[in-house]
Each structure stands twice: as structure tokens, then as C-alpha cells.
């Protein structure tokens, strides 16, 4: 049977602008032409997302930092762990859109 | 100072194909021309996402259901709560890409 309906306030609170986990595909170009494959081929980071209460506003980061993560670089003859740094958002805000 | 590096196993586990919360913008077209605005203008649902260990595989849903949620429909002179049904994924799998 179908689950109960999600109440409006919960729908609203979950949907609004806030840091949320997003999947970012990794670009092989970053690693030079020696690397044959990256494992994983995508990573997850916290980024601002969701909607703002008013059409004239947009969801933007107001707090950010770099997060470092280990990535397996498959090379021949050997493979090795590398490190990658990506921007992560810790705070967001609904701000008037730039004209 | 910069946080510690995220270990490879954790990076891999978080990035793999699984149900994850995504933001879905709502289309006003769904509601007819009486409705002036939907609040919120987007919702969150669980959808399959992330990457598969091999380029020949893609992340697809193997379990899904409909989730019902309340949306405020702003109309004139009055506004009212409506209900919307969206597909949500409960299970995912890495399957060979269709040729």
C-alpha cells in the first residue's frame, strides 16, 4: 500500500536551500595522461542546494572549505592512491539574484 | 587548518550507486493555469545515483514506489494544499549499459 502523505512543513523544510550531499563526477583530465582510470569515478561532497522561498532569491554558499579525499589512480604497471581536493559548502543562504 | 583526508574506502562507499536524496524542481505546468505559485518550488526524493565500478555499468533502480507529498498551491483569492505523487527509488543496482 502507498505510504502516508508527507506533511507540507516537512516537504518545505527538506526542500529549502541547505548544504546537501551531491555526486560529483571526476574528470580524468585532472590527473594527466598517465592515469587510465580513477576509482571511484565520482565522489560525494556537501554543496548548497534546494529552493528559496521567493523567485527573486537564489541558494548560494556563505561558508566553504576544501575537503581532501583519497582516490585510487589505476596506472600501468602499478596503481597508487592519490589525493584530491574539492570545495565543500558548510553554510548556505537565500540571496537576491544578481540583476 | 585543513581537515584530515577522507580515507579511500569511505570515499568509495559513499560514491557508489545507491538511493540518495536529490532535489527535483516542480513544474507549474502540472498544476494548470489557475495556480500562480507552488510552495515549495522543489521537493526532495530518494533517487538512484553515484557511480559504478566499471564504465560499462550504469546505476539503475530495482525497487521503486510512489511518495505522496503536500504542496501549497498559491491561487487567488485563496490558497490551498494539494497533493503530489513522485517516484522514489528504494533499491539500486549497477547493470550493464544498454547498447
Amino acid at each position: 500500500h502507498q505510504k502516508k502523505v508527507v506533511p507540507w512543513i516537512d516537504v518545505y523544510a527538506r526542500a529549502t536551500c541547505q548544504p546537501r550531499e551531491v555526486v560529483v563526477p571526476l574528470s580524468m583530465e585532472l590527473m594527466g595522461n598517465v592515469v587510465k582510470q580513477l576509482v571511484p569515478s565520482c565522489v560525494t561532497v556537501q554543496r548548497c542546494g534546494g529552493c528559496c522561498p521567493d523567485d527573486g532569491l537564489e541558494c548560494v554558499p556563505t561558508g566553504q572549505h576544501q575537503v581532501r579525499m583519497q582516490i585510487l589512480m589505476i596506472q600501468y604497471p602499478s596503481s597508487q592512491l592519490g589525493e584530491m581536493s574539492l570545495e565543500e559548502h558548510s553554510q548556505c543562504e537565500c540571496r537576491p539574484k544578481k540583476k | 587548518h585543513q581537515k584530515k583526508v577522507v580515507p579511500w574506502i569511505d570515499v568509495y562507499a559513499r560514491a557508489t550507486c545507491q538511493p540518495r536524496e536529490v532535489v527535483v524542481p516542480l513544474s507549474m505546468e502540472l498544476m494548470g493555469n489557475v495556480v500562480k505559485q507552488l510552495v515549495p518550488s522543489c521537493v526532495t526524493v530518494q533517487r538512484c545515483g553515484g557511480c559504478c565500478p566499471d564504465d560499462g555499468l550504469e546505476c539503475v533502480p530495482t525497487g521503486q514506489h510512489q511518495v505522496r507529498m503536500q504542496i501549497l498551491m498559491i491561487q487567488y483569492p485563496s490558497s490551498q494544499l494539494g497533493e503530489m505523487s513522485l517516484e522514489e527509488h528504494s533499491q539500486c543496482e549497477c547493470r550493464p549499459k544498454k547498447k
Epitope: Y12, T16, Q18, G50, C52, P53, C92, P96 | V39, S79
Partner: antibody, heavy 119, light 107 residues
Framework: QVQLQQSGPELVKPGTSVRISCKAS????????IHWVKQRPGQGLEWIGW????????NYNEKLKGKATLTADKSSSAAYLQLNSLTSEDSAVYFC????????????WGQGTTLTVSS | DIVMTQSHKFMSTSVGDRVSITCKAS??????VAWYQQKPGQSPKLLIY???TRHTGVPDRFTGSGSGTDFTLTISNVQSEDLADYFC????????FGAGATKLELK
């Protein structure tokens, strides 16, 4: 978790003014409206007005216009209620609360700030 | 201004009873009505909004109904922790609370 933390009790003299603060945490400050509500002892609730931190719009109860001024500081996620030309009629508990856009439904409330106006 | 009238200032009940608290709007407010519970020394707590939507975490013995000008909060199987003040609120045009609460007390 969402919290609205208000400043402590105030005892002030008639004719002066006071500023009550409400510090929001656990959510994105600019996605909800902040409202202020007055409650006199043994009486009902009276809405003072709202402040929307996203575009700094305000809306006041016509009856209380000129008595109250609503502001906020986005950088600290704090909202403020300033009351001026205080009289004994302003002695009350003041609550800050939040609501979604458009449907002014109050899902979280501050603990209340008691204001006593007395000479 | 829209006036919200809660005709009963006090309502007596017993544990296990069913009780209905009413609220009347001076003009049509659609379904833009919420109900709050307040206990002494505490902040109000949201129970029902849009006339009939139960807020998350609120026991299902609380139900709201009505539209237009007449609204009802029903508590079935009253528990001792339900003894409190109850306010209605309209947010169709500006925002007003019931003029005075309905106090639910034991018989």
C-alpha cells in the same frame, strides 16, 4: 536540530526602549520567516509582525505599528525585536517563532522573554 | 481584521473522553487555520495546520477539521498530558489568534 534561543528577562522603566534577541540554529536562516508574538499574563496570543531575512522585508500588525521594529543579522542568524516608548501595557512574554513562506504556521518557538515595565 | 472566536473558555473532560474545541472566523479563511497547545510556563506547540494536517510528532488522537468559518480540534481518548490551553490561528488574511484560549481541564 532547530532551535530558537531568546535573550533573558528584562526589567525596564516606562518611556525607555528594549531590544530582545532570538538566535536561530539548525536550519538555513534565510529560508523561513521570523515572527514575533506577544502574550500578556492570562491572555491570548497577539501577533506583532514578521521579518524575512532573505530579502529583509517586514510586515507589522497595524495595531502595533510604531511600537515595534523588527531587524535581523544574517551573519549571526539572529533576529531582533525592538520595543520603544514602553508602558505597563507592554509588560508581557515575547516569543520569536518561525514559519515557512506564505503559510504562516509556527513550527518552532523560542522559550519566550519576559519583559516587565515598571518604575 | 479577521476575528477568531473560541466560544468556550473552559472545557471539562475526563481521561479517555473525546472532546471537541471549536473556533469560528468572522469571515471565510478557507483552510488557513492552525491549532496550538500551550502548557503553563511553556511556549505554544503546533498541533494542526491547514485545518487538518497533523504536525509531525503529534499523536493521532488529535485531529482538525473544518473550512470557511467553522473549525474544530478533536481530541479522542484524552490523556492527562493533554490538559492545557488551546489556541486557534488564522493566516488567510494577515494573522490573528483566537481571542483567548480554551482551557481543557479535568472534571
Amino acid at each position: 536540530q532547530v532551535q530558537l534561543q531568546q535573550s533573558g528577562p528584562e526589567l525596564v522603566k516606562p518611556g525607555t526602549s528594549v531590544r530582545i534577541s532570538c538566535k536561530a540554529s539548525g536550519y538555513t536562516f534565510t529560508t523561513f520567516y521570523i515572527h514575533w508574538v506577544k502574550q500578556r499574563p492570562g491572555q491570548g496570543l497577539e501577533w506583532i509582525g514578521w521579518f524575512y531575512p532573505g530579502n529583509v522585508n517586514t510586515n507589522y500588525n497595524e495595531k502595533l505599528k510604531g511600537k515595534a521594529t523588527l531587524t535581523a543579522d544574517k551573519s549571526s542568524s539572529a533576529a531582533y525585536l525592538q520595543l520603544n516608548s514602553l508602558t505597563s501595557e507592554d509588560s508581557a512574554v515575547y516569543f520569536c517563532t518561525r514559519s515557512p513562506y506564505y503559510g504562516y504556521v509556527f513550527d518552532y518557538w523560542g522559550q519566550g522573554t519576559t519583559l516587565t515595565v515598571s518604575s | 481584521d479577521i476575528v477568531m472566536t473560541q466560544s468556550h473558555k473552559f472545557m471539562s473532560t475526563s481521561v479517555g473522553d473525546r472532546v471537541s474545541i471549536t473556533c469560528k472566523a468572522s469571515q471565510d479563511v478557507g483552510t488557513a487555520v492552525a491549532w496550538y497547545q500551550q502548557k503553563p510556563g511553556q511556549s505554544p506547540k503546533l498541533l494542526i495546520y491547514w485545518a487538518s494536517t497533523r504536525h509531525t510528532g503529534v499523536p493521532d488522537r488529535f485531529t482538525g477539521s473544518g473550512s470557511g468559518t467553522d473549525f474544530t480540534l478533536t481530541i479522542s481518548n484524552v490523556q492527562s498530558e493533554d490538559l492545557a490551553d488551546y489556541f486557534c490561528q488564522q493566516y488567510s488574511s494577515s494573522l490573528t489568534f483566537g481571542a483567548g484560549a480554551t482551557k481543557l481541564e479535568l472534571k
